[in-house]
């Protein structure tokens, strides 16, 4: 007897973090023997959607023409072959940005920092939030994810970086969120450019990345270092 059918692969284009009103396509890729694809959304009646496979039958497309809060959540997909249903795919978490007003991102003591010194990026929201994310432009994932203990609401989160090196230079943004749905994020903050200059020990200027509108993922998203900030927030490395 053959083993269970291999699980399909589930992904979203242009990514799994989509701003309000924008289109997103969810893809489920199975095998050439697939006859039908099913998409399930957690806490929604199953199946959430069904699609016939696209030629050559190894994948199906599920389209969301305009992202809203209703579409944010965790998805899994399955395919049916002549021998039955596959195992579920790994989950896809579809996150919507634009649910809350944008936070403010600043650098303390300054966005101009000497290599080897310390800097703290401060993300502040107008209303109390319990989750804050810091991203670096062109990074595919958040660098830091700070969540408050026991759902305590905060107006800000600190992201300390120490010691700073030239690779910390670049453009950052932050998002805020409520814990009751980590699938809903705020609008992004305005960008903050962190400029790192050479240290006294190394008089050569470190190359700083100019503000870029490129959207590709960086190979190695940089993790800021330092102690847990004094904000009642837990640090979650992504």
């Amino acid at each position: 007897q053959a083993g269970p059918l291999p699980k399909p692969t589930l992904w979203a284009e242009p990514g799994s973090v989509i701003s309000w009103g924008n289109s997103v396509t969810i893809w489920c890729q199975g095998t050439l023997e697939a006859r039908e694809y099913r998409l399930d959304k957690e806490e929604s009646p199953a199946p959430w959607d069904r699609q016939n496979p696209l030629e050559p039958k190894n994948k199906a497309r599920f389209s969301i023409p305009s992202m809203t809060e209703d579409y944010a959540g965790r998805y899994r997909c399955y395919y049916r072959s002549p021998v039955g249903w596959s195992q579920p795919s790994d989950p896809l978490e579809l996150v919507m940005t634009g649910a809350y007003s944008k936070p403010t991102l600043s650098a303390l003591p300054s966005p101009l920092v000497t290599s080897g010194k310390s800097v703290t990026l401060l993300c502040q929201s107008r209303s109390p939030m319990d989750t804050f994310l810091l991203i670096k432009e062109r990074a595919a994932h958040p660098l830091l994810h700070l969540r408050s203990e026991h759902g305590a609401q905060q107006h800000q989160a600190e992201f300390p970086m120490s010691p700073v090196t030239s690779v910390h230079g670049g453009t950052y943004r932050c998002f805020s969120s409520h814990g009751f749905s980590h699938y809903l994020l705020s609008h992004p903050s305005d960008p903050l450019e962190l400029i790192v200059s050479g240290s006294l020990e190394d008089p050569r200027p470190s190359p700083t990345r100019s503000v870029s509108t490129a959207a590709g993922p960086e190979d190695q998203p940089l993790m800021p270092t330092g102690s847990v900030p004094h904000s009642g927030l837990r640090r979650h490395w992504e």
Partner: antibody
Amino acid sequence: QVQLQESGPGLLKPSETLSLTCTVSGGSISPYYWSWIRQPPGKGLEWIGYIYYSGNTNYNPSLQSRLTISVDTSKNQFSLKLSSVTAADTAVYYCARRGYSFGFYYGLDVWGQGTTVTVSS
Amino acid sequence: DIQMTQSPSSLSASVGDRVTITCRASQDISIYLAWYQQKPGKVPNLLIYLASTLQSGVPSRFSGSGSGTDFTLTISSLQPEDVATYYCQKYNSAPWTFGQGTKLEIK
């Protein structure tokens, strides 16, 4: 520095098919949205449609029945085909890029120089 | 489809003046609005995206504000090189409609 260059015939007769290509140099076609915009003489900008680098498209409803946008990632090019052209399709045609980052989108941040297309019998 | 309406369609101001151009969407578009500048005979240039985020390299005298349906582009101190036509554009769900443009001239 990413640069876009439109190419294609400048003069067409009514009922012919307009074919334009936009070549992307100095950067990758992935992972961006690529758009076509046109501007009739002395008038404003009109969005034609876009293609995501993977091939997903979205068209202006007023042009949808005549329009095809495609992408060739191996050549770093994307193309526009507009069938059954009339004098109303006379315009400068631009290609442009829209970037996507974690959870937000840029505007059309890189544009080609534009190519003039005239439809006349 | 959502319509984008700019006002005024043209305006004339003096060097150093504060200039305001407005853009109204027929439905809520949150902050997914961009502003472009097109100088005579030139290619459009992105000034502002996400309603208020200044594009890299754009002078700080340009600013954007608004959300929902009402948006504003402000030039804090008009310079001779700002003579151009300015367009707003919604760019969340397709179609990515442009406003009809505002032609700005120097008195």
